[in-house]
């Protein structure tokens, strides 16, 4: 169990930013923050819930835009943003810090939401290390922050996954629960068996190798499907495999915005303050009644207080309240390299030649779905289709009827009749062949290939 | 011209489950819009039921929400309601409409379809 | 749910005189992120479906005659048909689409 702990220094006009308020005159506002952590360093989707935690900060002071005036750093809220942690700390992690600004003004239906920045970090954190600091920019704005991980005793280490005892163990109380803030002194940690995993095990003799929850193995290297003590959190026994107390799942109030944690068989419960909710009270009380769908976007969930919602987004835009435009193109839905143009309303694609469809998925030199008429069969070559038609036939699809004696077909100045079946062609004397190409030799055998038997030469050769 | 055409069963028994279809001509349902159920009981006021994106999300009345499933058939252009355990109460005209996202208004009307809930 | 009350349920006026419907709602349909309110007025006439006339409270549809008007904010809503003519005996319903969707129980115009 742990602590992921943030810190706002600044919001502000970033460099060649905005160097005027980039708002019309309006009445009071404030900001706040939500902060959000998402385990992993991979690109999750922009929906997945904040398995790691979520919290909201408090409200910064009351200021007024001057739309006229230099645009100064926002007046902030007071304190860290916390967000507990119960199990191991990750160690890589995203981190999404949302700036909303509240305006204060005679609205009906109360005040309104809008979210003017939002920046991602995906980082690699040890837990117990120093502050480290960033600066992010989203758009003409510019966020300071800095953010640590510190485990909550007794949890240890860099992901808080090792327990420590104190020196004055008899001083602390049953079994492992944390100690007094002065007694955290923890023993160095005993040399485990060879071999012990350094991510799943942990000892607290010498040469012995115990497994975390969801462990087992002399090496604590094989993961454990079911387990009959599921639930409590903390060291497994040797001899049970069941796991000694660790630390409470209320210790330490995980639950957010001044929610009450009350504990429950494995688990806690936060019963959340109106206006949040969530399994730590870390979101904030926004609802359908707000009208929180940016873009047209439909809302949907309860209506009151303490419900949950989502958007239901139109075409083009995204995130939790569809204020994200969606640059469609960039998933590149053109096909055959179409031309990709995002119309606000709908996609559109330019096709290359030789490509249709509202996708340009439809190639029209493929043979696939392609007649060729009259008999003509279809061949593909070279990105191109063509058809080889039929005696008697020509053009692209072979719909034209062609003249099969116009292109002369036969040789050494026989002569061409047109029959239903194809050309039959009448050789000059001393050829013959289907197109009197072979020329006959003068003892009356001709050359290859040999006239087939009964065929005179001279005589009309019919051309299949 | 986006033409919209209830289809299904007149007569439904009750405790049944009412079936309709909805076949959408001159827009693709997978473009834009919400895909809507609207009912009119006989000489009463509109009901909206509920609704299926143009992406497939769903939302539905909560006072029928335990009843009603809504889907689509993108490859016919078509999106479906059903709802179960009929009573007669149910017996209404049934609309097909699209909503605009931009406007939140009920675009255009299917002409209806009248489904009789009686044994 | 929000809930959506019309009144009159039926209203009589005589042909070029002014029709007035009002509508209330249970809670605000103003949003202050778009500045909109979220309520539409729709024409149903005999064996037909509705029709759009109005959305956002005052906005009128492409195609409405502009003798159609709506106004209003917040929680009251009105719509009004400044010279009834004969073409406009109908239900008129309003409707509210700030949360999920719910409509008005109707109000039938006649001629006077």
């Known amino acids: 169990a742990g602590v992921f702990e943030l810190q706002i220094h600044s919001f502000g006009p970033g460099p060649g930013g905005a160097p005027r308020s980039p708002y019309s005159a309006r009445g009071p506002c404030r900001l706040f923050f939500r902060v959000c952590l998402k385990p992993g360093l991979s690109e999750e989707a922009a929906e997945s819930p904040c398995a790691l935690g979520a919290a909201l900060s408090a409200r910064g002071p009351v200021y007024t835009e001057q739309p006229e005036a230099p645009a100064p750093d926002l007046p902030l809220p007071n304190g860290l943003l916390q967000v507990p942690f119960r199990d191991a700390w990750p160690g890589t992690f995203s981190l999404i810090i949302e700036t909303w600004r509240e305006e204060l003004g005679d609205q009906i239906g109360g005040p309104a939401w809008s979210l003017l920045a939002r920046v991602t970090r995906r980082r690699r954190l040890a837990a117990g290390g120093p502050w480290a600091g960033d600066i992010q920019r989203a758009g003409a704005w510019e966020l300071r922050f800095s953010y640590r991980a510190r485990c909550e005793l007794p949890a240890v280490g860099t992901a808080c996954t090792r327990l420590c005892r104190p020196r004055s163990a008899s001083r602390c109380g049953p079994g492992l629960r944390p100690c007094a803030p002065l007694e955290d002194e923890c023993e160095a940690p005993p040399v485990c068996r060879a071999g012990c995993s350094l991510e799943h095990g942990f000892c607290e003799q010498p040469g012995e190798c115990r497994c975390l929850e969801g462990w087992t193995g002399p090496l604590c290297m094989v993961p454990v499907s079911t387990s009959s003590c599921l639930g409590l959190r903390g060291p497994s026994s040797t001899t049970t495999g069941c796991l000694v107390p660790g630390p409470g799942p209320c210790d330490g109030n995980p639950c957010a915005n001044g929610g009450s944690c009350s504990e429950t068989p494995g688990s806690f419960e936060c019963t959340c303050p109106r206006g949040f909710y969530g399994l730590r009270c870390e979101v904030s009380g926004v609802t359908c009644a707000d009208g929180p769908c940016f873009n047209g976007g439909l809302c949907v969930g309860g209506a009151d207080p303490d419900s949950a919602y989502i958007c239901h987004c139109p075409p083009g835009f995204q995130g939790s309240n569809c204020e994200k435009r969606v640059d469609r193109c960039s998933l590149q839905p053109c096909r055959n390299g179409g031309l990709c143009l995002d119309l606000g309303h709908a996609l559109r694609c330019r096709c290359r030649a030789g490509f249709a469809g509202p996708r340009c998925e439809h190639d029209l030199n493929d043979c696939a779905g392609r007649a060729c008429a009259n008999g003509g069969t279809c061949v593909e070559g070279g990105g191109a289709h063509r058809c080889s038609c039929a005696l008697g036939f020509g053009g692209r699809d072979c719909r034209e009827r062609a003249d099969p004696c116009a292109a002369r077909p036969c040789a050494h100045g026989g002569r061409c009749y047109a029959h239903f079946s194809g050309l039959v062609c009448a050789c000059a004397p001393g050829y013959m062949g289907a197109r009197c190409e072979f020329p006959v030799h003068p003892d009356g055998v001709s050359a290859l290939p040999a006239a087939p038997p009964g065929l005179r030469p001279g005589d009309p050769q019919r051309y299949p | 011209q986006v033409q919209l055409q209830e289809s299904g069963p007149g007569l439904v028994k009750p405790s049944e489950t009412l079936s309709l279809t909805c076949t959408v001509s001159g827009y693709s349902i997978t473009s834009d819009f919400y895909w809507n159920w609207i009912r009119q009981p006989p000489g009463k006021g509109l009901e909206w039921i509920g609704y299926?994106?143009?992406?497939?999300?769903?939302n539905y009345n909560p006072s029928l929400k335990s009843r009603v499933t809504i889907s689509r058939d993108t490859s016919k252009n078509q999106f479906s309601l059903k709802l179960s355990s009929v009573t007669a109460a149910d017996t209404a005209v049934y609309y097909c409409?699209?909503?605009?996202?931009?406007?939140?208004?009920?675009?255009?009307w299917g002409q209806g379809t009248l489904v009789t809930v009686s044994s | 749910d929000i809930v959506m009350t019309q009144s009159p349920d039926s209203l009589a006026v005589s042909l070029g005189e002014r029709a007035t419907i009002n509508c209330r709602s249970s809670?605000?349909?103003?949003?202050?992120?778009?500045?909109?309110?979220?309520l539409a007025w729709y024409q149903q006439k005999p064996g037909q479906p509705p029709k759009v006339l109005i959305y956002?409270?005052?906005t009128r549809e492409s195609g409405v005659p502009d003798r159609f008007s709506g106004s209003g904010s917040g929680t009251d809503f009105t719509l009004t048909i400044s010279s009834l003519q004969a073409e406009d005996v109908a239900v008129y319903y309003c409707e509210q689409s700030f949360y999920l969707f719910t409509f008005g129980q109707g109000t039938k115009v006649e001629i006077k």
């Open positions: 809670q605000s349909l103003f949003n202050s992120r778009t500045r909109k309110n979220y």
């Open positions: 299926i994106t143009y992406d497939g999300s769903t």
């Open positions: 409409v699209y909503g605009d996202f931009n406007r939140h208004a009920m675009d255009y």
């Open positions: 956002w409270a005052s």
